[in-house]
Interface confidence: medium
């Protein structure tokens, strides 16, 4: 089952080389796997990583570095992702999503 999760920050503009933080507000009782996607114009959405709330661990997609995206926060209420060392190619719409089973 798919759940829609509310992102608190709707739009951010940052300089290259800086960082940005995105917050994902979780539905009450959200458990399981919380996924982060990047959707860029003209491309299919790309999953960057997912958070396994059962083991409190993060699984990265291939080619994604632990230093680039940092996910943390309370999985019961919200989950935050920091994007570091921003480049122009990081521009796009970031989504979080969860599947309950």
């Amino acid at each position: 089952k798919s759940s829609n999760l509310e992102g608190r920050t709707k739009s951010v503009i940052r300089q290259t080389g800086s960082s940005a933080e995105i917050t994902c507000d979780l539905a009450e009782g959200s458990t399981g796997y919380i996924h982060w996607y990047l959707h860029q114009e003209g491309k299919a959405p790309q999953r960057l990583l997912y958070y396994d709330s059962y083991t409190s661990s993060v699984v990265l997609e291939s080619g994604i570095s632990p230093g680039k995206y940092d996910t943390y926060g309370s999985t019961r209420k919200n989950l935050r992702m920091i994007l570091r060392n921003l480049i122009e190619n990081d521009s796009g719409v970031y989504y979080c999503a969860t599947w309950d089973g």
Partner: antibody, heavy 120, light 107 residues
């Protein structure tokens, strides 16, 4: 000058625990992911675990998942590896390594290593 | 997991010879490939990252090339301090895996 100094190694019986530490200096510790890499005697290098700058994201090799826990204290500029249920095959020199990333992720600074021996 | 295979496992060379070490990945890793040098009893040292970028402070006689699955580390004219073991490592996906190493010995 970047420095990484590991400690906590030693002789431990199979099934026992051990905690390794890595004291970091010379860079903004909380801004960088950190890793543990090990090397069994006479063997090659094996990546063990990584942790993001905030400590919120952790990653493990399958061989240690569920037994080892990586953590960090950014206020003390220290990286840790809690090792439980140790096995003979965990015997190795354990290195902490600072990670950097640009186009790719790489280990640009390493500590001198600390030896862990698991034996009865 | 991505397997990294280095060849040869060892080689003998003279000072000034050209040394080439190859590394093959079990699947395409783009340029997510790093090279390290290790001397006996010492920690590894980063030489090359992103397949061909020379780490700061590393002599220009070291160079790297390749993309996809096949990569090469070249020492154009080895000096006595270059005789060591060299490892490739992929950082395309976790677990980050290393090649088994290539020991470069003095002939």
């Amino acid at each position: 000058e970047v420095q990484l100094v590991e400690s906590g190694g030693g002789l431990v019986q199979p099934g026992g625990p051990l905690r390794l530490s890595c004291a970091a200096s010379g860079f903004t510790f909380s801004s960088y992911a950190m890793n543990w890499v090990r090397q069994a005697p006479g063997k090659g290098l094996e990546w063990v675990s990584a942790i993001s700058g905030s400590g919120g994201s952790t990653y493990y090799a399958d061989s240690v998942k569920g037994r080892f826990t990586i953590s960090r204290d950014n206020s003390k500029n220290t990286l840790y590896l809690q090792m439980n249920s140790l096995r003979a095959e965990d015997t190795a020199v354990y290195y902490c390594a600072k990670a950097d990333y640009g186009v790719v992720y790489y280990f640009d600074y390493w500590g001198q290593g600390t030896m862990v021996t698991v034996s009865s | 997991d991505i397997q990294m295979t280095q060849s040869p496992s060892s080689l003998s060379a003279s000072v000034g010879d050209r040394v080439t070490i190859t590394c093959r990945a079990s699947q395409s890793i783009s340029t997510y490939l790093n090279w390290y040098q290790q001397k006996p009893g010492k920690a590894p040292k980063l030489l090359i990252y992103a397949a061909s970028s020379l780490q700061s402070g590393v002599p220009s006689r070291f160079s790297g090339s390749g993309s996809g699955t096949d990569f090469t580390l070249t020492i154009s004219s080895p000096q006595p301090e270059d005789f060591a073991t060299y490892y490739c490592q992929q950082s395309y996906s976790t677990p980050y895996t290393f090649g088994q190493g290539t020991k470069v010995e003095i002939k």
